[in-house]
């Protein structure tokens, strides 16, 4: 079952999923200057059965250099001060994550997508949290959020996190810190 | 709560055009496109477009090119459609949509008599 | 354009029986496709999505099934509250089309 809304946004946060549920979708957005081609998906989805998952659809892009006749455009939106959620990544995945069943990994880039990649959850997804570059990680307790069901509506889990304004950044659970990777992301990750 | 408010019922005169809105709450207003649906008695459920708030990037419906117009102000998480030269073929209910169709709001009826 | 036929534009079932609404498409849309259930004076309400994912809070008789272009949206164990209008949606190519809608009257 589909989660009503979207993680809880924690301020100079930003989350991931090491694995998606099934069930999952994957809106096909394209960077700035190009469109989803006319006959494309919506969105992907994790589609399978417990042994294994994959995938469905493929997102494609095209160029909107006839926008003004067409006006098919799927853009990058224009301001994105503080990525809020799950950012484009290439396809770096522990080893044993497609042993998880149920879950899909972290879908690989298609050609033109934006920067920025839009998840639909569902019931039961857990997504990490850690602190933009920059930032050091205060925490309370857990730094994730779940979707969980409650008398028939969903609700997302409160990380215990807070990030501070020190240099120091944050990883996701098992990670090692980062050297000089990009926005202090992670080269390789471990399963949840 | 994720929710979309749309505008009051509009009584309008054949020939004008009109403005309605659908105002956003409980989500990321820029991360997600919202339709535009158009339901008529006896004619079902028509797909008039959408907008990205984002960019104010737009897809139309064929039959609705220079009928439909669609615009977004991100300060107030509210989008827009306007209908021009209005016709009793206009008179229906129009639904905005966000979140790949899973949330609607609760239409905004449209009646055009002289 | 897609077109999406529901062949039944009424249905007449009794509750606690199970009725299957159908919808064809006049092309391949994957399993592009979702079903709306809207009642007298109100906004469509989202049931499937991918075909046959429910969302939230949509109680587990109903079902959706079908890729390609022949869909299924199935109510086992109908009850009362189920008198409504479901519509199923392609999304698979611009225009996004809808069905004509299958009126379901209960006995």
């Known amino acids: 079952e589909l989660c009503d809304d979207d993680p809880p946004e924690i301020p100079h946060a930003t989350f991931k999923a090491m694995a998606y549920k099934e069930g999952t979708m994957l809106n096909c957005e394209c960077k700035r200057g190009f469109r989803r081609i006319k006959s494309g998906s919506l969105y992907m989805l994790c589609t399978g059965n417990s042994s294994h998952s994959s995938w469905d659809n493929q997102c494609q892009c095209t160029s909107s250099a006839t926008r003004n006749t067409t006006k098919q455009v799927t853009p990058q939106p224009e301001e994105q001060k503080e990525r809020k959620t799950t950012e484009m990544q290439s396809p770096m995945q522990p080893v044993d994550q497609a042993s998880l069943p149920g879950h899909c990994r972290e879908p690989p880039p298609w050609e033109n997508e934006a920067t920025e990649r839009i998840y639909h959850f569902v019931v039961g997804q857990m997504v990490y949290y850690q602190c933009v570059q920059g930032y050091r990680a205060l925490h309370r307790g857990p730094a994730e959020s779940v979707c969980k069901m409650t008398h028939g509506k969903t609700r997302w889990t409160q990380p215990q996190l807070i990030c501070t304004g020190e240099m120091e950044t944050s990883q996701f659970p098992g990670e090692e810190k980062p050297q000089a990777s990009p926005e202090g992301r992670p080269e390789s990750e471990t399963s949840c | 709560q994720i929710q979309l408010q749309q505008s009051g019922a509009e009584l309008v005169r054949p020939g004008t055009s009109v403005k309605m809105s659908c105002k956003a709450a409980g989500y990321t207003f820029t991360n997600y496109w919202i339709g535009w649906v158009k339901q008529r008695p006896g004619h079902g459920l028509e797909w008039i477009g959408d907008i990205h708030p984002g960019g104010s990037y737009t897809n139309y419906n064929e039959n609705f090119k220079g009928k439909a117009t669609f615009t977004a102000d991100t300060s107030s998480s509210t989008t827009y459609m306007q209908l021009s030269s209005l016709t009793s073929e206009d008179s229906a209910i129009y639904f905005c949509?966000?979140?790949?169709?899973?949330?609607w709001g609760q239409g905004t009826p449209v009646t055009v008599s002289s | 354009d897609i077109v999406l036929t529901q062949s039944q534009k009424f249905m007449s079932t009794s509750v606690g029986d199970r009725v299957s609404v159908t919808c064809k498409a006049s092309q391949n849309v994957g399993t592009n496709v979702a079903w709306y259930q809207q009642k007298p004076g109100q906004s469509p309400k989202a049931l499937i999505y991918?075909?046959?994912y429910r969302y939230s809070g949509v109680p587990d008789r109903f079902t959706g099934s079908g890729s390609g272009t022949d869909f299924t949206l199935t109510i086992s164990n109908v009850q009362s509250e189920d008198l409504a209008e479901y519509f199923c949606q392609q999304y698979n190519s611009y225009p996004y089309t809808f069905g004509g809608g299958t009126k379901l009257e209960i006995k």
């Open positions: 949509t966000s979140r790949n169709f899973a949330k």
């Open positions: 991918s075909a046959s």
